[in-house]
């Protein structure tokens, strides 16, 4: 049974040419995470795994950073980084959780940080 | 220099059991998910059998789930694929390959031909 | 389970051609499909991963675009060498498929 909840970011805004930190966290379950992938839509930006240690999409190396911990930097922003990101949490025995996160990118100065909430 | 080395096929009667082996080497072998993908003469290619490099997923194919095993010895570096009740489909070049982040595989090995014949 | 359909099956071309190999997942796969290259009697080769991603030490005329549902496999000059069998496949989920092959053949 899946008992984790996993917490993320949420909807998040930020500058463009700045940067973000897209965060999830996994909690209230002792199952082992053994990758954690990050998607965009239907793009792979970067996976995190337990043995392997990460690895970043060629077509994202400029401007995806890994870390702090599981999380991943953008870097460089463009109002064309606007959309849904998604965290991968491959755990065992558990299975899979997947967490989402809204970036938007804005032209302006007026970049505020949303709420943190919780998928379940 | 990673290298797969697939061994243990041949020619065995329908209804009977082969083990094939797949020793790893020139990296470290216990960070890595594997697969089996096998091949039957002049056709495409048919996913087998995964398993995870320690965490205990193991996945099977439909067309082989019950009759074949998928395991692995992290001491030895050695994968294997234990085949029961062996069938005339089953009659394929099997190839072992390395799977970083349960993705891609990006190693194959030489293939081992086996053949369910009577 | 994901039907993974390739086309064409077959393609005659010339060296210096541009080629396109496309691929059909029967749902959406994100960016879960690798290209293969297979030669008679040789093991395949990963070509591209992440449906975009050109494995290290293969040459950069071979690219691969798309996701969801639909996908391509370009090589930009065709060279003698390239003459083979091509293979998509998803990792989305198991089982695993692959395409039925497209054979590359000299015209």
């Known amino acids: 049974m899946m008992t984790g909840t996993i917490e993320t970011t949420g909807n998040i805004s930020a500058e463009k040419g700045g940067s973000i930190i897209l965060q999830c966290h996994l909690s209230s379950t002792t199952a082992q995470v053994t990758q954690v992938n990050w998607e965009q839509q239907d793009q792979l930006l970067a996976i995190c795994n337990a043995d392997l240690g990460w690895h970043i999409s060629p077509s994202f190396k400029d401007r995806v950073a890994p870390g702090p911990g599981l999380g991943l930097t953008l870097q460089s922003l463009t109002v064309n980084d606007t959309g849904e990101y998604f965290c991968i949490y491959h755990t065992y025995p558990d299975g899979t959780y997947t967490g989402r996160i809204f970036l938007e990118v804005l032209e302006s100065s007026v970049a505020e940080h949303g709420a943190r909430f919780q998928i379940p | 220099e990673v290298q797969l080395l697939e061994s243990g096929g041949g020619l065995v009667q329908p209804g009977g059991s082969l083990r094939l082996s797949c020793a790893a080497s020139?990296?470290?072998?216990?960070?890595?998910?594997m697969s089996w993908v096998r091949q039957a003469p002049g056709k495409g290619l048919e996913w087998v059998a995964s398993i995870k490099g320690s965490a205990g997923y193991i996945y099977y194919a439909d067309s082989v789930k019950g009759r074949f095993t998928i395991s692995r010895d992290n001491s030895k570096n050695t994968l294997y694929l234990q085949m029961n009740s062996l069938r005339a489909e089953d009659t394929a070049v099997y190839y072992c390959?390395?799977?970083?982040?349960?993705?891609?595989?990006?190693?194959w090995g030489q293939g081992t031909l086996v053949t369910v014949s009577s | 389970d994901i039907q993974m359909t390739q086309s064409p099956s077959s393609l005659s071309a010339s060296v210096g051609d541009r080629v396109t190999i496309t691929c059909r997942a029967s749902?959406?796969?994100?960016?879960?499909l690798n290209w293969y290259q297979q030669k008679p009697g040789k093991a395949p080769k990963l070509l591209i991963y992440a449906a975009s991603s050109l494995q290290s030490g293969v040459p950069s005329r071979f690219s691969g675009s798309g996701s969801g549902t639909d996908f391509t496999l370009t090589i930009s000059s065709l060279q003698p060498e390239d003459f083979a069998t091509y293979y998509c496949q998803q990792s989305y989920s198991t089982p695993l498929t692959f395409g039925g092959g497209t054979k590359v053949e000299i015209k």
């Open positions: 749902q959406s796969i994100s960016s879960y």
């Open positions: 390959a390395r799977v970083p982040y349960d993705y891609w595989m990006d190693y």
């Open positions: 020139g990296f470290t072998f216990s960070s890595y998910s």
